[in-house]
Interface confidence: low
């Protein structure tokens, strides 16, 4: 199936940059969001620190690490009460993501 320009293939995501102010090149303002074309039974999530389509059951059960949200080589841990996850780099630096 051929894709038109700007069309999303099923099961894929793209990062869309909004509000780009090109009139001030030294102070470019860019707000990024993700658009995903997920199949039935999937919803937007995070895999390898990028937007992706993930199994909806992961979100329902709050098993965030099942999305593989961290980068390759990082360790994933659920936060207490499953309110999000942490990604621990080999050097020990921790990035915490909470889900509202």
């Amino acid at each position: 199936q051929f894709l038109k320009e700007g069309q999303l293939a099923a099961g894929t995501c793209e990062i869309v940059t909004l509000d780009r102010d090109s009139s001030q090149p030294r102070r470019t303002i860019a707000r990024q969001t993700a658009r995903c074309a997920c199949r039935k039974g999937q919803i937007a999530g995070t895999t390898r620190n990028k937007p992706s389509c993930v199994d909806a059951r992961i979100i329902k059960t709050k098993q965030w690490c099942d999305m593989l949200p961290c980068l390759e080589g990082e360790g994933c841990d659920l936060l207490i009460n499953r309110s999000g996850w942490t990604c621990t780099q080999p050097g020990g630096r921790i990035k915490t993501t909470t889900v509202s």
């Epitope: 700007g6 069309q7 658009r35 074309a37 997920c38 199949r39 919803i43 937007a44």
Partner: antibody
């Protein structure tokens, strides 16, 4: 069981802003793309707009400036900024199953029962 | 702006007959169409998604077909409980302008 319920519909006078809310049970609103749809008495369905997990929104061309969709951790809200009598309708919130991609499985799998908004002097 | 032209606006059928409702999109929507049934005082319910996929729990007498810009909902062997209004919903998403969804005007199906 996964369900949606709308609230906030009532009689308002023209020009009085009104905010409707949609709450979910059985699933987490935060991970889903959500839409609002309305239906005037005896008329067909009209899509108003969609909100993404990031909070960004897209609207039908006729709805831009007339409606604002926003969300909290537990609700998806629809503000009718300056109601007119033409906005008298039942307003439904609906869950987008997965995502509305260009030409791929564009559909709403769960709908709320609707909330009636009447705009009258 | 996407336009979905749904025909006919209304129809009357006898139990057991085959009913067909057509939606014509103003552009190629790549099977991005779904079909809904709505009864008075109730919200719509999903019948078909992705042009031809039957939603779970929907009787198999309902089917969807079509491609490009031309799509059809077929009710094979219509039953009394199928009296309702039916809507198509078409959708396109461009990365530049976002998502645009449009409902057809609806088809009121009466069972004789």
């Amino acid at each position: 069981q996964e369900q949606l319920v709308e609230s906030g519909g009532r009689l308002v006078t023209p020009g009085t802003p009104l905010t409707l809310s949609c709450t979910a049970s059985g699933f987490f609103l935060s991970g889903y793309y959500m839409s609002w749809v309305r239906q005037a008495p005896g008329k067909g369905l009209e899509w108003i707009g969609i909100i993404y997990p990031s909070g960004s929104t897209d609207y039908a061309s006729w709805a831009k400036g007339r409606f604002t969709i926003s969300k909290t951790s537990t609700t998806v809200d629809l503000k009718i900024t300056t109601p007119t009598t033409e906005d008298t309708a039942t307003y439904f919130c609906a869950r987008v199953a997965g995502y509305v991609g260009y030409g791929y499985e564009t559909f709403f799998d769960i709908w709320g029962p609707g909330t009636l908004v009447t705009v009258s002097l | 702006e996407l336009v979905m032209t749904q025909t006919p606006p209304s129809l009357s059928a006898s139990v057991g007959e085959t009913v067909r409702i057509r939606c014509l999109a103003s552009e190629d929507i790549y099977s991005g169409i779904s079909w809904y049934q709505q009864k008075p005082g109730k919200p719509p319910t999903l019948l078909i998604y992705g042009a031809s996929n039957l939603e779970s729990g929907v009787p198999p007498r309902f089917s969807g077909s079509g491609s490009g810009s031309d799509y059809t909902l077929t009710i094979g062997g219509v039953q009394a409980e199928d009296a309702a209004t039916y809507y198509c919903l078409g959708g396109v998403t461009y990365s530049s302008t976002g998502t645009h969804l449009t409902f057809g005007a609806g088809t009121n199906v009466e069972i004789k």
